[in-house]
């Protein structure tokens, strides 16, 4: 196969999580207590975990989770094949990337199998509440005599998709420096004092152009540049302030 | 729900042309990938060409430089332009659509047991 690029794709609206729940319309003789919410997270397209409190129930209850896709050919659910517990008792579901699809509504029902009526129906948009891992393999390169070059790799996902948070700080500084970099994975410094020791860390986000997930990636092993001879020393900061 | 549905298949003398057209609804078209595959009788389903949603295009060896893959946004349609057509090109068409491809980096565009949504094929017979 070959390829060429056409066109570059346009940056469509993406809708924000939208979350509904409803119990079951059947008259009840005594109120019916609610469930706990459901929260899935995508972790970097290799599997989903959808948990809730437990430890909510009054009494240990192994609820069930069942979940299909709004626009599935049938509307009928499928239940968790992969329980996660807590003290032996359901608080989650994982399921496996073969079963995501995160620009199709993601309907999810909790059900406490005692009480059929007592359900609650959640409707998600997996492309809003997904987790990258964090970047890898940080390498740092000289561009010229002052100016440094930061690379880094993401695992799975493209890097159209990513939008990255980098820090850096010297030991001289206080607080870190930090920007966004948007879907490259390269940052450049243009100027850095080579007497100084400077650390770099970054992590990801799932935004803006594939989805609207607000929620960061842990941040990446940091690497360092510069005079090993100087450490951080705090008193140092008590001088300068 | 998902729906695609090709049309344009036909009967033709090799040589001749035939264009192939592939409505899709139920869902967002601008995050898919779209592929043609076919399949002869007695052998493997195989990719023809796909398209990805910036645009980009590939295609099997075997059609480079007579067919082209090009999709209408504003009507949720694919289309496979068939020109210069041969016997051996006689199967049946599908076209089939998956979102994976938009933001994994080891989604092969070439392999039909990537794709989640398909069709339900048109026949392409094409005469000597």
């Known amino acids: 196969w070959s390829s060429k690029v056409l066109m570059s794709s346009a940056n469509e609206d993406i809708k924000a999580d939208l979350i509904l729940t409803s119990t079951a319309p059947e008259h009840l003789s005594a109120p019916t207590l609610p469930l706990p919410e459901v929260q899935c997270f995508v972790f970097n397209i290799e599997y989903m975990n959808c948990t809730w409190n437990s430890s909510s129930e009054p009494q240990a209850t192994n609820l069930t989770l069942h979940y299909r896709y709004k626009v599935s050919d049938n509307n009928t659910f499928q239940e968790c094949s992969h329980y996660l517990f807590s003290k032996e008792i359901t608080s989650g579901c994982q399921i496996q990337k073969e079963d995501i699809q995160l620009y199709q509504t993601f309907v999810v029902q909790l059900q406490d199998p005692q009480k059929p009526q007592r359900r609650a129906v959640q409707k998600l948009n997996l492309q809003n509440l997904v987790i990258p891992r964090a970047p890898e393999n940080l390498t740092l390169s000289n561009l010229s005599e002052s100016q440094l070059e930061l690379r880094w790799k993401s695992r799975h996902i493209k890097e159209r998709c990513l939008q990255y948070l980098v820090q850096y700080r010297s030991n001289r500084d206080r607080s870190w420096t930090e920007l966004i970099v948007n879907h490259e994975p390269r940052f450049s410094l243009p100027s850095v004092d080579e007497l100084k020791r400077y650390t770099f860390r970054v992590r990801s986000r799932y935004n803006p152009i594939c989805g609207s997930s607000q929620q960061w990636s842990k941040w990446s092993q940091p690497v360092h540049w510069g005079s090993h001879t100087v450490e951080e020393n705090p008193s140092l900061f008590a001088l300068e302030a | 729900q998902v729906q695609l549905q090709e049309s344009g298949g036909g009967s033709v003398q090799a040589g001749g042309s035939l264009r192939l057209s592939c409505a899709t609804s139920g869902f967002p078209y601008s995050r898919y990938c779209m592929g043609w595959f076919r399949q002869a009788p007695g052998k493997e389903r195989e990719g023809v060409a796909a398209?990805?949603?910036?645009?980009?295009?590939s295609y099997a060896d075997s059609v480079k430089g007579r067919f082209t893959i090009s999709q209408d946004n504003a009507v949720n349609t694919l289309y496979l332009q068939m020109n210069n057509l041969k016997p051996e090109d006689t199967a049946m068409y599908y076209c089939a659509a998956d979102e994976r491809c938009f933001y994994l980096k080891d989604y092969d565009l070439r392999r039909p047991a990537q794709y989640r949504y398909w069709g339900q094929g048109t026949q392409v017979t094409v005469s000597s």
């Open positions: 398209i990805e949603p910036d645009g980009s295009t």
